[in-house]
Interface confidence: low
């Protein structure tokens, strides 16, 4: 016996969490993984006093203590449809079925004499079915439904009489199933029948407050498990050859501070107080664990010394359940302070731990819903996905020796002091009904799926690809809004005059009268942040930089009788140097944020967006830079994510919807202005770029959701890539949808009407298809009413615990970015398509491994659509060059330009062209390549103010 | 153009097995937003829906016959297949498949399109 | 399960105004579509969504729906209306289709 649990909050240092494994296991389990699911007697038998069946203590129990709840004849129904249950097991394709049976319904009063012969028959029946199914079962002696009279005769648990009652109970048991059961388990988590039948009396027979009585209860609960072990072990094991266990259950618990040994010696404590309690003396040494005895010695019962050399060692491998049971409502005691939590693999590791690395069965698992939700049950899914993905870490990882698992619970039912105010099946059912129809849950689809492939071995994404991207291929790097530098900070040479410092012992400078020196012409490099600028873009070796212009700096006033040179020269400089560097300029003209809209001072104060003279405010303005700026910059952007400007214009969906149209035609105006009167000369690209993150429906077993992601991409994209790219109209979906719930009285909005005019002059306003790509969002069908853009939709999100996410719970799914480049070239056309923003935010601020993981693997999904998929993808834009102070940070460099490291891994990216075979020599010509030229590079960072 | 068309035996016998099948062109099976019904009307009688494939492989049956229904598709055939066992006289009718859109609502917004219907006859 | 009602016959005079019944419990929640049905032919949905029309259907045919009961309303009737209407719902709960009953419009004369 070992006992070093503690050891499990000293967090392991090599954790990384880009190593997807330690979040995510794609693998699968072992070959003759057991794989069940299980029922309570009580909760889904029902027929409480049918066909001579004697009442429990929760029948009881139900009729004093539980409001609103007549018996626990409103469930399942098992008793009378045992034939639908074994369909519902026969669907999910469960290699064994845990049941328990109902003492009262084969004793009536809890003495074996004569067994209830209907009750003897309906077991039978149901063992002989598994049987013939192949499904092997595992039986619970006690669920909690002792017979009413042993508790009305000897108080129930806390008179050992009833341990030498349970005893022949249990032989009978084994005599007339014994030989079709392998695994028997003796009691169902003895914790929570001590704790809250005779401590809080949330559970029957519903005393509380006497903290010996509890105790006592705990300690018969472990004598009468023991005495039945080792009566099976002496009488019926040589035969029946099975084995037999409890099942004890837990909750886990982190410290709140993992470097404190105080938090860590409390959480210690608090599973040792749980878990321990029944663990220690079976699975332990004999005896409760120290810390028990010294804390509870009034209270705690002892065991002798024969009694402790009889307890231990009596199961034949660890029985544990880990469900909302043993979680709520968790007493303060068991918390001592510290943060509870669902980590099965901690706790799993735990018991390896503390109790030498037994065999473990987990004979519960699961959680529940509210009872509202019928056969809907997307969380549950992401629940079950969670803890099989640590059950399956800690056999793989941590080589646990997990064999089994029981999801619970096959059917709705009676849920104990929630009554029927929770759901915990992977059937539905419906109580009311007369039929008791099982309907299976997305989460039986998605145990059944599990089931089927021994885990989780469908990886989402094909395996990496070996290729390059095409020579004309643009890297880039994107930056938000430059603001422009008013005055150049390096004011040397152009003033002439000669100054003498300190001439009078007052430290200041006195021009010399009479001399005018020479001056020499502005030079870019005279704006010191423009030298920044370009010392982090020689390190990035990209071969394009976007960022965006600031209106507001541009034309302060909105229109051009007042435009800021000295401001367009910064803009020039920005593109002009880089450009001596091979560095191309895409160009964003307006790049509004949720928290700054960036609009000239008066457009703000008349409305914004929400007026439609912004749109010719903005034409202007796109015209005044294509004529500034066009003859050095061959790719713009007109504006940055409007499909986003929704946040902002968020007071009611027609006002999100007014300023999304005139955006449109802002965007439109420009283009035409370009196409008309620059395109000839200047032979640039204008498009828009969108933000454009992927949906996956959150339940791929509900159709709902299947429409929900189409949905999403139709609100978030097709809302401005229809008009533009295709139709000059708002997508028919979108429209029809917003419509249809108009019509329902669920929202007053509505989306414009177009007129001709308006469909001409947006329509083929793109000269390629620039997508903002980020993340993929699991998306969900969900009816909100409002009359704002977010309820319009009727979605909501969800966030998979399971998936690598950023600080700002980005989840990192690379197979999205080609879902969506996919999807794009099916809806609008073979298109050129540029991804003008891609990126995550990661803490690190030297080795920022995040973003590196990112970066390669999403480079890949572009790369296998580009090779595989045929998508004309011209360019990709990393997301961004530098942080800002106080945001989330995305950045390559830090705010104050420090590298970090995943700037030299785009730099191989780049130099690579992608991810090439080796030794692979597709070189590119030496005018298409983008160069290093050291001079230059050096030539940049010398020169001089 | 989108069409549907169904095809089958003429004439089954009782206990036999029936087995329809529904060739769809103009649209794809695995588009997300389009499912596929079976309706059968006996001669004289309403119309009775019998079951429903979703885009995602979701399979509906109506309650009385679910028994007897399996429903599938072979998206790369363009068709989707209807068996109903143990055919009995009383099951003689002209069966439809017809196709359902999602558009704006909240579920499929009718069936708009449907097969000119086939006429099985259940007898000995 | 869900149940709709419809009238089995509605006769009305050419030129006047038919109105079809559908009811269902609270169907004014669900969405509910109409077919026509002439004889030896396949049905053709005529409204969907309680009230829209498909593209090629005359606007004399219009919908509606609230409390407990949804109608097809027919003006200017014809001749050539005459025939078998259905109404149609999915029972969101348990994903089935339900049809009406049918009712058998008749032009007089």
């Known amino acids: 016996f070992s006992g070093d649990g503690r050891a499990i909050w000293s967090k392991n240092p090599n954790f990384t969490p880009v190593n997807e494994s330690q979040l995510f296991l794609y693998d699968t389990f072992p070959k003759n993984f057991f794989w069940g699911i299980g029922t309570g007697a009580l909760q889904v038998e029902g027929s409480w006093k049918k066909d001579g069946k004697g009442p429990s203590i929760w029948d009881h129990f139900i009729h004093t203590h539980l409001k609103n709840v007549s018996s626990t004849n409103g469930s399942s129904d098992s008793y009378i449809f045992l034939e639908k249950d074994l369909s519902a097991l026969d669907f999910i394709g469960v290699s064994f079925y845990q049941f328990s049976i109902s003492w009262p319904r084969l004793f009536p009063d809890g003495i074996v004499t004569v067994a209830n012969a209907k009750g003897l028959q309906y077991y039978s029946t149901l063992l002989d079915a598994l049987v013939l199914r192949n499904i092997e079962p595992i039986v619970t002696l006690y669920h909690w439904d002792l017979p009413l009279a042993l508790q009305e005769k000897y108080g129930g648990w806390k008179n050992d009489t009833i341990i030498d009652i349970f005893n022949d109970y249990a032989t009978y048991c084994f005599q007339m199933f014994g030989d079709r059961v392998k695994y028997w388990i003796t009691i169902h988590n003895p914790y929570l029948v001590a704790w809250h039948g005779y401590g809080t009396g949330m559970h029957a027979p519903g005393e509380k407050g006497n903290l010996a009585a509890v105790y006592t209860v705990g300690h018969n609960l472990i004598k009468a498990h023991s005495k039945v072990w080792h009566n099976y072990n002496t009488h019926f094991r040589p035969h029946q050859k099975g084995w037999l266990s409890i099942t004890l259950g837990s909750h886990w618990i982190e410290p709140n501070r993992s470097e404190n040994t105080m938090d860590i010696f409390k959480c210690q404590q608090s599973m040792v107080s749980v878990l321990g309690w029944f663990a220690n003396p079976i699975h332990g040494d004999g005896d409760y664990p120290e810390g028990m005895r010294k804390k509870l010695f009034s209270v705690l019962p002892i065991f002798s010394e024969a009694e402790k050399h009889e307890m231990r060692g009596t199961a034949d491998f660890f029985a544990f359940s880990f469900g909302p049971n043993n979680f709520k409502p968790l007493n303060t005691m068991a918390k001592m302070g510290q943060n509870v939590s669902l980590n099965l693999r901690e706790a799993l590791n735990w018991i390896k731990l503390e109790y030498n690395n037994p065999r473990i069965l987990i004979a519960e698992n699961g959680w529940f819903t509210d009872s509202r939700v019928k056969t809907e049950d997307t969380t549950a899914i992401y629940m079950m996905k969670n803890f099989l993905s640590q059950v399956l870490q800690a056999i793989r990882l941590d080589e646990i020796r997990v064999f089994g698992y029981t999801a619970w619970s096959l059917l709705d039912g009676f849920e104990w002091q929630d009554a029927y105010t929770i759901r915990r099946g992977l059937f539905y059912v419906d109580f009311n009904s007369k039929q008791k129809e099982r309907k299976p849950k997305s989460s039986a689809h998605y145990y059944k799926q599990i089931i089927r492939e021994n885990g989780f071995s469908l990886k989402e994404s094909t395996p990496d690809v070996q290729g390059q991207f095409p020579c004309d291929f643009s890297w880039g790097v994107t930056e938000s809004v430059l603001k422009p530098e008013s005055v150049a900070s390096s004011p040397q040479f152009s003033d002439p005059h000669l100054y003498v410092w300190n001439a009078t012992g007052n430290r200041l400078l006195h021009r010399v009268e009479g001399v005018r020196l020479k001056t020499r012409p502005a030079q870019c490099t005279d704006f010191v942040n423009i030298k920044k600028q370009l010392e982090m873009l020689a390190r990035m070796k990209v071969t394009h930089y976007r960022f965006a212009l600031d209106w507001a700096s541009v034309l302060p006033t909105g229109n051009l009788s007042a435009v800021n040179r000295q401001a367009l020269r910064y803009y020039r400089c920005v593109v002009s140097e880089g450009l001596k560097l091979g560095i191309s300029a895409m160009v964003t003209l307006y790049y509004p944020t949720h928290a700054h809209l960036g609009l000239p001072e008066p457009l703000l104060h008349a409305d914004g967006w929400l007026n439609p003279s912004t749109a010719e405010a903005f034409q202007a303005y796109a015209g005044l830079c294509f004529q500034e700026l066009g003859d050095l910059v061959k790719l713009w952007i007109t504006i940055n994510e409007p499909n986003r400007l929704s946040d902002i214009y968020n007071r009611s969906g027609n006002d999100t919807y007014g300023a999304a149209h005139n955006l449109l035609v802002a965007h439109a105006l420009a283009w035409r202005l370009y196409d008309r009167q620059f395109r000839p000369s200047q032979r640039g690209a204008v498009s828009l770029s969108l933000h454009a993150d992927w949906a996956e429906p959150a339940n791929p077993y509900a159709d709902s959701h299947w429409r929900a992601a189409e949905r999403f991409l139709q609100f978030e994209i097709a809302w401005f890539a229809e008009p533009l790219f295709k139709t000059g109209d708002y997508p028919a979906a979108m429209r029809e949808y917003i419509a249809s719930k108009h019509r329902r009285g669920l929202s007053s909005s509505a989306l414009p009407r177009l007129t001709e005019a308006e469909r001409r002059l947006l329509k083929g306003t793109v000269d390629f298809c620039a997508l903002n790509h980020f993340t993929t969002r699991f998306v969900m069908h969900e009816q909100l009413a409002g009359s704002r853009y977010d309820s319009d939709r009727d979605i909501q999100f969800l966030q998979d615990i399971t998936r690598l996410s950023s600080p700002t719970r980005l989840a990192v799914i690379p197979w999205g970015v080609r879902k969506l480049l996919r999807w794009v070239r099916r809806n609008y056309g073979d298109m050129d398509i540029y991804i003008t923003a891609s990126g995550i935010d990661d803490q690190a601020l030297e080795d920022d491994r995040l973003r590196k993981y990112y970066l390669g693997k999403y480079l890949q999904e572009v790369l296998k659509a580009y090779l595989i998929d045929k998508v004309r993808i011209k360019g990709y834009y990393a997301f961004k060059l530098a942080e800002e102070k106080s945001k989330p940070r995305f950045g390559f460099f830090t705010s104050d330009f420090k590298a970090k490291s995943s700037i030299q891994f785009y730099n191989k990216v780049i130099s690579s062209r992608g991810f090439p075979f080796e030794n692979s020599s597709s070189r590119c010509s030496q005018t298409q390549e983008n160069t290093e030229c050291t001079v230059c590079l050096f030539l940049v960072q010398k020169k001089p103010l | 153009q989108v069409t549907l068309k169904e095809s089958g035996p003429v004439l089954v016998k009782p206990t036999e097995t029936l087995t329809l099948t529904c060739t769809v062109s103009g649209f794809s099976l695995n588009n997300a937003r389009v499912g596929v019904s079976w309706i059968r009307q006996p001669p004289g009688k309403a119309l009775e829906w019998l079951a429903h494939?979703?885009?995602?492989?979701?399979?509906s049956y109506s309650t009385s016959l679910k028994s007897r229904l399996t429903i599938s598709k072979d998206t790369s055939k363009s068709q989707v297949v209807l068996t109903m066992t143990n055919m009995d006289p009383v099951d003689t009718a002209t069966y439809y498949c017809?196709?359902?859109?999602?558009?704006?609502?909240?579920?499929?917004?009718?069936?708009?399109?449907w097969g000119q219907g086939t006429t099985v006859t259940v007898s000995s | 399960s869900y149940v709709l009602t419809q009238p089995p016959s509605v006769s009305v005079a050419p030129g006047q105004t038919a109105r079809i019944t559908c009811g269902g419990n609270?169907?004014?929640?669900?969405?509910v579509h109409w077919y026509q049905q002439k004889p030896g032919q396949a049905p053709v949905l005529v409204v969907y969504?309680?009230?829209d029309r498909p593209s090629g259907i005359p606007e004399r045919f219009s919908g509606s729906n609230s409390g407990n009961t949804a109608t097809l309303t027919i003006s200017r009737v014809e001749a050539g209306d005459e025939a078998d209407y259905y109404c149609?719902?999915?029972?969101?709960?348990?994903?089935?289709?339900?049809f009406g009953g049918g009712t058998k419009l008749t032009v007089l004369g």
């Open positions: 494939i979703f885009s995602n492989d979701e399979k």
């Open positions: 017809a196709r359902s859109v999602v558009t704006g609502g909240y579920y499929y917004d009718g069936m708009d399109v």
């Open positions: 609270n169907i004014g929640s669900e969405s």
């Open positions: 149609q719902v999915w029972d969101g709960e348990s994903d089935h289709v339900v």
């Open positions: 969504d309680d009230s």
